[in-house]
């Protein structure tokens, strides 16, 4: 029950996140005009990764796309293939991990498969969280060196009697979400990973053997052996429990595959 | 079509508060901003301040602290009041329907303002 | 607040002929995000209210003629009517859109000679 909602918190987890991802990659506030210490005017300014937007204090927005490849900075295009990256693997590893998902059955896959599925899921995830974190944490860096720039030469004087303002960007709502959203992807896929040891089968059973020693007549079962912790491992002899009961026997100090949460 | 119509008092003792409405038709209060412009009898234009969509306010800096605009959506109406009038408030006084480039691209046909005793 | 400074004050034409009026603003109003200058001219005939000629500094409001034009970039600005025509004897305003408190020109009275 553990390793089951473990793992579909992990789903959802993930699933927010990427959505979250996806959301900070198509908003346009990835830098927003600074407003503080700056001249107040009726135009604010503000940027995405796929184009820029200016309002007007009269109602008016308008948005216009980045139509060049090769003439954006390098590091906005860094910042886009990771968003990208990060999209993509996330994708994958929620599409990985519906299959993989306990609670939902699909032919006759067993628990070594969906336990492989969680664990491929879990990396996916974690993977696309650090690409979000670093996307978001490179353009961010950008825009504190930028704004740094700029407020060094705030105002340029054009023959010491016109000044032009330059226009200082900082931090936009969509950095916020792409941190959190990159947080809780990296969160959803260590949970499932966590979910993948509970669902790897942990123990080899075999078949009761009786041993006749000599004057003693007791019955000896290698039940608590671990088995493998390989992916591949042998399910075919599985522990049945029937409603939790155990035999004295079978009351042993190594974690079941039930005890992970 | 596109209207907009000041109402005012007309005539106002010095130190007392004009108030002044603007009616708009044809667009929504809550979409457009609307600015108020004055003239003086022979005068230049003089930009007194706006109210723009979502409600906040830009105001003349030397005429600030006796402006005061508001706006009910609902009623489609702009009021601008101003207090402690002299001879100098004596003007031609516009309401504006703010625009592209926060230009104003519809006026009303002014309301004249004499402040006399 | 930024100081708008038209010249000249007033501008005689004759009937056809071109005319240029200028405008100078204390700041730039060039916003560097949409590479769009923040000037209006407007056109005020006696006894009317302001009428909006130009935007953007250069973009023409709809049903303005198109012998009205709009130049210039960061702190200078020209109004230019290629052919003056009689209904053009008005005062001609400009305005900082840019910064708060938005300002007038002191204008430019066209006068037909």
């Known amino acids: 029950m553990a390793v089951t909602a473990c793992q579909g918190l992990g789903f959802v987890v993930s699933l927010i996140g990427i959505a979250g991802i996806i959301a900070a990659t198509c908003m346009d506030q990835w830098s927003t005009q600074d407003l503080y210490n700056n001249p107040v005017t009726a135009v604010f300014n503000y940027q995405g990764l796929w184009r820029s937007c200016v309002r007007e204090s009269s109602g008016f927005t308008e948005c216009r796309g980045y139509f060049t490849l090769l003439g954006l900075p390098a590091m906005l295009q860094a910042v886009r293939a990771l968003m990208i990256v990060g999209i993509v693997l996330g994708a994958i590893g929620l599409l990985v991990s519906i299959f993989a998902l306990k609670c939902i059955r699909i032919g006759s896959m067993e628990d070594s498969a969906k336990a492989n599925m969680t664990l491929t899921s879990g990396i996916m995830f974690i993977v696309s969280g650090l690409c979000a974190i670093a996307g978001v944490s490179v353009f961010a860096n950008m825009l504190v060196t930028n704004f740094w720039m700029s407020t060094a030469n705030m105002y340029t004087g054009m023959g010491g009697m016109v000044q032009t303002v330059q226009t200082r960007y900082t931090f936009g709502a969509a950095l916020f979400v792409g941190w959190v959203a990159g947080g809780l992807t990296l969160i959803g896929g260590v949970m499932m990973c966590i979910a993948c040891r509970g669902l790897a089968p942990e123990e080899t059973n075999y078949k009761a053997v009786s041993y006749h020693a000599s004057g003693h007549s007791v019955a000896y079962k290698p039940g608590g052996f671990k088995a493998s912790t390989g992916f591949g491992s042998n399910t075919k002899n599985k522990k049945i429990y029937d409603g939790g009961a155990r035999t004295e026997d079978e009351v042993q100090s190594y974690p079941s595959k039930h005890d992970y949460v | 079509q596109v209207q907009l119509k000041e109402s005012g008092p007309g005539l106002v003792a010095p130190s007392e508060t004009l108030s002044i409405t603007c009616t708009v038709s044809?667009?929504?209060?809550?979409?457009?901003?609307v600015q108020w412009v004055r003239q003086p009898p022979g005068k230049g234009l003089e930009w007194l301040g706006a109210?723009?969509?979502?409600?906040?306010?830009n105001y003349n800096s030397a005429l600030m602290s006796r402006l005061t605009i508001s706006k009910d959506n609902s009623k489609s109406q702009v009021s601008l009041k101003m207090s402690s009038l002299t001879a100098a408030d004596t003007a031609i006084y516009y309401c504006?329907?703010?625009?592209?480039?926060?230009?104003?691209?519809?006026w009303g046909q002014g309301t004249l303002v004499t402040v006399s005793s | 607040d930024i100081v708008m400074t038209q010249s000249p004050s007033s501008l005689a034409v004759s009937l056809g002929e071109r005319a240029t009026m200028n405008c100078k603003s204390s700041?730039?109003?060039?916003?560097?995000?949409?590479?769009?200058?923040?000037l209006t001219w407007y056109q005020q005939k006696p006894g009317q209210p302001p009428k909006l000629l130009i935007y953007?500094?250069?973009t023409r409001e709809s049903g303005v003629p198109d012998r009205f034009s709009g130049s210039g970039s960061g702190t200078d600005f020209t109004l230019t009517i290629s052919s003056v025509q009689a209904e053009d004897l008005a005062v001609y305003y400009c305005?900082?859109?840019?910064?708060?408190?938005?300002?007038f020109g002191q204008g430019t009275k066209l006068e037909i000679k």
């Open positions: 504006a329907k703010g625009g592209y480039g926060n230009a104003m691209d519809y």
């Open positions: 044809g667009f929504s209060l809550t979409t457009y901003g």
């Open positions: 109210i723009w969509a979502g409600g906040n306010t």
């Open positions: 700041q730039s109003l060039l916003n560097s995000g949409n590479q769009k200058n923040y």
């Open positions: 953007w500094a250069s």
């Open positions: 305005q900082n859109d840019y910064f708060f408190p938005f300002t």
